[in-house]
Interface confidence: low
């Protein structure tokens, strides 16, 4: 009773709801629940009933497995989803899974808060811009990443000039996606481009992916 | 020239509290990142934490988490640790060191001793 | 987190000679962002190489760094008087940053 899974999914995909076990050997019933009551799907007496809801429309039932289907998933379909299996033998048996549906994040936009000569050295400010989005942030100089304790939308750092990096990337990310943003720098310590304050890896000609999938899938099993 | 000199170090019963300093000269102070790392007697270097040249970032290793706080006051070109529910296994020098783009240290200062015993 | 592991642990020595000292991680440190650094009894770590290959202002020409991925050398071409001490390595290609256990350059 009560085995709970949870699930991310990106909005707008299609998701299938199923156990990783197989359902009881000719159960009498099965039924799909949103939260606790509500019903979406029953199965008895070999047909499914569609009961009116929301997934309406969307959803699919496959009895044999149990498997729930539901297409193009919206951050309102987040919730608890319960399947109550009735056995031959009158007793009942539950599955529930957590379904969190996540909008993919937005392209963030660097700015540059400060930029000053210090001690021969460049002292820089850039804040990670996205709109109210619930993200995480990793901050990359020419691709090594900073320290985890950096990861904000603040990345505040004093260049020396034999560790210069040249471009600063923003990686937002939540559970289903990842963004990146690109400044960069000329030495000693001024914009690559005086004239604009945001330079951009398309701005850069193509020429320089700054992170490859597999960078990042490298940096984030440090 | 960079200088860093530490203060503040003793002896301190378990579960006592401690606070060091360290003032910083020769060097823009508040841009700079900080940070904190020990040596118990005999032993090798374990960095403790860290604190960016605003004060606005900090972290810790996971053996003092909870009972250490870095913070400075850039107006005063001064680090400081404070340090609570102190335990025999934090017995050590206690080094500031101006952190590198947050990659080594350089320079350091000349430690601080800090033993906790009964 | 990456662990460092220097080797060896102590070396007997007499000055002019010279030393190799190993530091291995247990996993590829990204770009050799990897330091040396020299203690002397009583004494602060003083940075000697940065980049696992670049000595730092001030440090003689003796000193030098090399290596890449997970393994990592510094060698003390003639070991001069002042130059017995501990020296340890650092990782900072990764967070936390780390050290190796350091190892002990005594004289014989």
């Known amino acids: 009773q009560g085995h709970l899974v949870h699930m991310t999914v990106v909005s707008g995909s299609n998701v299938t709801l199923n156990i990783s076990e197989s359902l009881p050997e000719n159960y009498k019933q099965l039924t799909w629940f949103y939260t606790f009551d509500q019903k979406i799907v029953e199965w008895d007496s070999r047909k499914s009933k569609y009961f009116e809801s929301k997934f309406k429309g969307r959803v699919r039932l496959d009895p044999q497995s149990g498997a729930l289907y539901i297409s193009k998933v919206q951050k309102e379909d987040n919730s608890t989803y319960i399947m109550r299996v009735l056995k031959k033998t009158g007793n009942e048996q539950e599955w529930k899974i957590k379904l969190q549906v996540l909008d993919p994040v937005p392209k963030p936009v660097i700015k540059i808060e400060k930029i000053e000569d210090m001690d021969d050295n460049c002292y820089l400010k850039l804040s990670c811009v996205i709109p109210g989005e619930s993200v995480n942030y990793t901050w990359y100089g020419d691709k090594r990443p900073f320290p985890k304790e950096l990861q904000n939308s603040v990345l505040e750092t004093t260049l020396m000039p034999h560790n210069y990096s040249r471009c600063y990337t923003c990686q937002v990310s939540n559970s289903v996606s990842s963004k990146n943003g690109t400044v960069c720098l000329s030495p000693p310590c001024t914009l690559a481009r005086s004239e604009q304050k945001l330079i951009s890896e398309e701005d850069l000609g193509g020429e320089q992916k700054l992170i490859s999938e597999e960078d990042l899938h490298h940096h984030h099993h440090h | 020239e960079v200088q860093l000199l530490e203060s503040g170090g003793g002896l301190v019963h378990p579960g006592g509290s401690l606070r060091l300093s360290c003032a910083a000269s020769?060097?823009?102070?508040?841009?700079?990142?900080m940070s904190w790392v020990r040596q118990a007697p005999g032993k090798g270097l374990e960095w403790v934490s860290l604190i960016s040249g605003s004060g606005g970032s900090t972290y810790y290793a996971d053996s003092v988490k909870g009972r250490f706080t870095i913070f400075r006051d850039n107006s005063k070109n001064t680090l400081y640790l404070q340090m609570i529910s102190l335990r025999a296994e934090d017995s050590a020098v206690y080094y500031c060191?101006?952190?590198?783009?947050?990659?080594?240290?350089?320079?350091w200062g000349q430690g601080t001793l800090v033993t906790v015993s009964s | 987190e990456i662990v460092l592991t220097q080797s060896p642990g102590t070396l007997s020595l007499s000055p002019g000679e010279r030393v190799t000292l190993s530091c291995r991680a247990s996993?590829?440190?990204?770009?050799?962002?990897l330091a040396w650094y020299q203690q002397k009894p009583g004494q602060a770590p003083r940075l000697l190489i940065y980049?696992?290959?670049s000595r730092a202002t001030g440090i003689p020409d003796r000193f030098s760094g090399s290596g890449s991925g997970t393994d990592f050398t510094l060698t003390i071409s003639r070991l001069e008087p002042e130059d017995f001490a501990v020296y340890y390595c650092q990782q900072y290609g990764s967070s936390p940053r780390t050290f190796g256990q350091g190892t002990k350059v005594e004289i014989k």
């Open positions: 996993q590829s440190v990204s770009s050799s962002y």
């Open positions: 980049g696992a290959s």
């Open positions: 020769g060097f823009t102070f508040g841009g700079y990142a």
């Open positions: 060191a101006k952190y590198s783009n947050y990659d080594y240290f350089d320079p």
